[in-house]
């Protein structure tokens, strides 16, 4: 098995992930593993020398970088919060704070905004990934209601009056629950007509 450094006439290396082509010497050299950087470049007689990233810096990939990237905190002003810390092999992982969605994306989320309210009679469609997009409000399905303007309220099933030993006084809508009454209670005058029919 050939180990770096080795000559390459076609400018390609056997292991693209862990080796790179050095055009000046026309050789393949080792990349440095995640968490390290190149402290001494390779030559025809000596392979790449790697050193560990200093604290608060990282390199995520096999690389031939001469520096490590600086760890950056999640910016709360931009609505971001940390979900996993920066280490020598990985940058800080951020996500939108609860109640927010990613409004600006450049390889990763850079800015979060408040989720829109869903009006009464609707709820936010459930997403695969929290914080990925703004709310898409969908109507409550039959037999359910939601009576507030909220980014997170869910449609609830209408109360079943009979389960509580009551009778229905007014049916539920998408925006209101069923109204129940005691069977012994008389109907209000404006509803007495419907009883006669």
């Amino acid at each position: 098995q050939v180990v770096p450094p080795y000559g390459s006439e076609n400018q390609t290396c056997r292991d693209q992930e862990k080796e790179y082509y050095e055009p000046r010497h026309r050789i393949c050299c080792s990349r440095c593993p995640p968490g390290t950087y190149v402290s001494a470049k390779c030559s025809r007689s000596r392979d790449t020398v790697c050193a560990t990233c200093a604290e608060n810096s990282y390199n995520e990939h096999w690389n031939y970088l001469t520096i490590c990237q600086l760890c950056r905190p999640c910016d709360p002003v931009m609505g971001l919060e940390e979900i996993a810390p920066c280490t020598s092999k990985r940058k800080t992982q951020c996500r939108c704070q609860p109640g927010m969605f990613c409004a600006a994306w450049a390889l990763e989320c850079t800015h979060c905004e408040l989720l829109s309210d869903c009006p009464p009679g609707t709820e936010a469609e459930l997403k695969d990934e929290v914080g990925k997009g703004n709310n898409h409000c969908v109507p409550c399905k039959a037999g359910h209601f939601q009576n507030t303007s909220s980014p997170s309220a869910r449609c609830q099933p209408h109360t079943r009056c009979e389960d509580q030993g009551l009778v229905e006084a007014a049916p539920g809508t998408a925006q209101s629950d069923t109204t129940c009454r005691n069977p012994s209670e008389s109907l209000p005058p404006e509803m007495s007509g419907t009883m006669l029919m």
Partner: antibody, heavy 121, light 113 residues
Framework: EVQLVESGGGLVQPGGSLRLSCAAS????????MSWVRQAPGKGLEWVSG????????NYADSVKGRFTISRDNSKNTLYLQMNSLRAEDTAVYYC??????????????WGQGTMVTVSS | DIVMTQSPDSLAVSLGERATINCKSS????????????LTWYQQKPGQPPKLIIY???TRESGVPDRFSGSGSGTDFTLTISSLQAEDVAVYYC?????????FGQGTKVEIK
């Protein structure tokens, strides 16, 4: 040769204190995070505490928070664990472990032989 | 905290046969930016400290025999010993290092049948 050697274990009464040490050799100590991992008799592994290479970042398992303190002296290549208000459930072999990283959140590539801590009256 | 669950708790395998240990994490430990799973496997022989054998779910630590292999991604992982040897008798632990605190599985004891 890369090596970690723990010391300071022993028998202590509930409520007592103990200070564990871990002497490191064979690598640039200040470049790497270190952790304490414990193993109760016949049980599995439990991460106890970690400290970054410079000593600037520390973290603790909920079970020891407020009672244990991790520290390091990079000039002496030594890691410490100060254990106060010890309980019977702290009885375990305590290992010091090196991370392949300046942050303790990584694979533990080197382990010491461990030191036994017994908390009993 | 991320909970790691191993199965089975113990395993008896004949010499030269395959041993398979599973590890499931309660949360995803795959980091999409570098496509790495932040999961390791350790081997602990009686009376000894644990020894790192696999990191990033599938990369063998130097000096570890190639009969040991790791696979899986996201939340489901496997350690395979392709042909069990007498010196492989040990307890094997998985561990995630995706998020603080790092957490271990409960261990799987591998014995010879």
């Amino acid at each position: 040769e890369v090596q970690l050697v723990e010391s300071g274990g022993g028998l202590v009464q509930p409520g007592g204190s103990l200070r564990l040490s871990c002497a490191a050799s064979g690598f640039t100590f200040s470049s790497y995070a270190m952790s304490w991992v414990r193993q109760a008799p016949g049980k599995g592994l439990e991460w106890v505490s970690g400290i970054s290479g410079s000593g600037g970042r520390t973290n603790y398992a909920d079970s020891v928070k407020g009672r244990f303190t991790i520290s390091r002296d990079n000039s002496k290549n030594t890691l410490y664990l100060q254990m106060n208000s010890l309980r019977a459930e702290d009885t375990a072999v305590y290992y010091c472990a090196k991370s392949d990283n300046w942050h303790y959140l990584d694979a533990f590539d080197i382990w010491g032989q461990g030191t036994m801590v017994t908390v009993s009256s | 905290d991320i909970v790691m669950t191993q199965s089975p708790d113990s395993l008896a395998v004949s010499l030269g046969e395959r041993a398979t240990i599973n590890c499931k994490s309660s949360q995803n430990v795959l980091y999409s930016s570098n496509n790495k799973n932040y999961l390791t496997w350790y081997q602990q022989k009686p009376g000894q400290p644990p020894k790192l054998i696999i990191y990033w779910a599938s990369t063998r630590e130097s000096g570890v025999p190639d009969r040991f292999s790791g696979s899986g991604s996201g939340t489901d992982f496997t350690l395979t010993i392709s042909s069990l040897q007498a010196e492989d008798v040990a307890v094997y632990y998985c561990q995630q290092y995706f998020n603080t605190p790092p957490t271990f599985g409960q261990g799987t004891k591998v014995e010879i049948k």
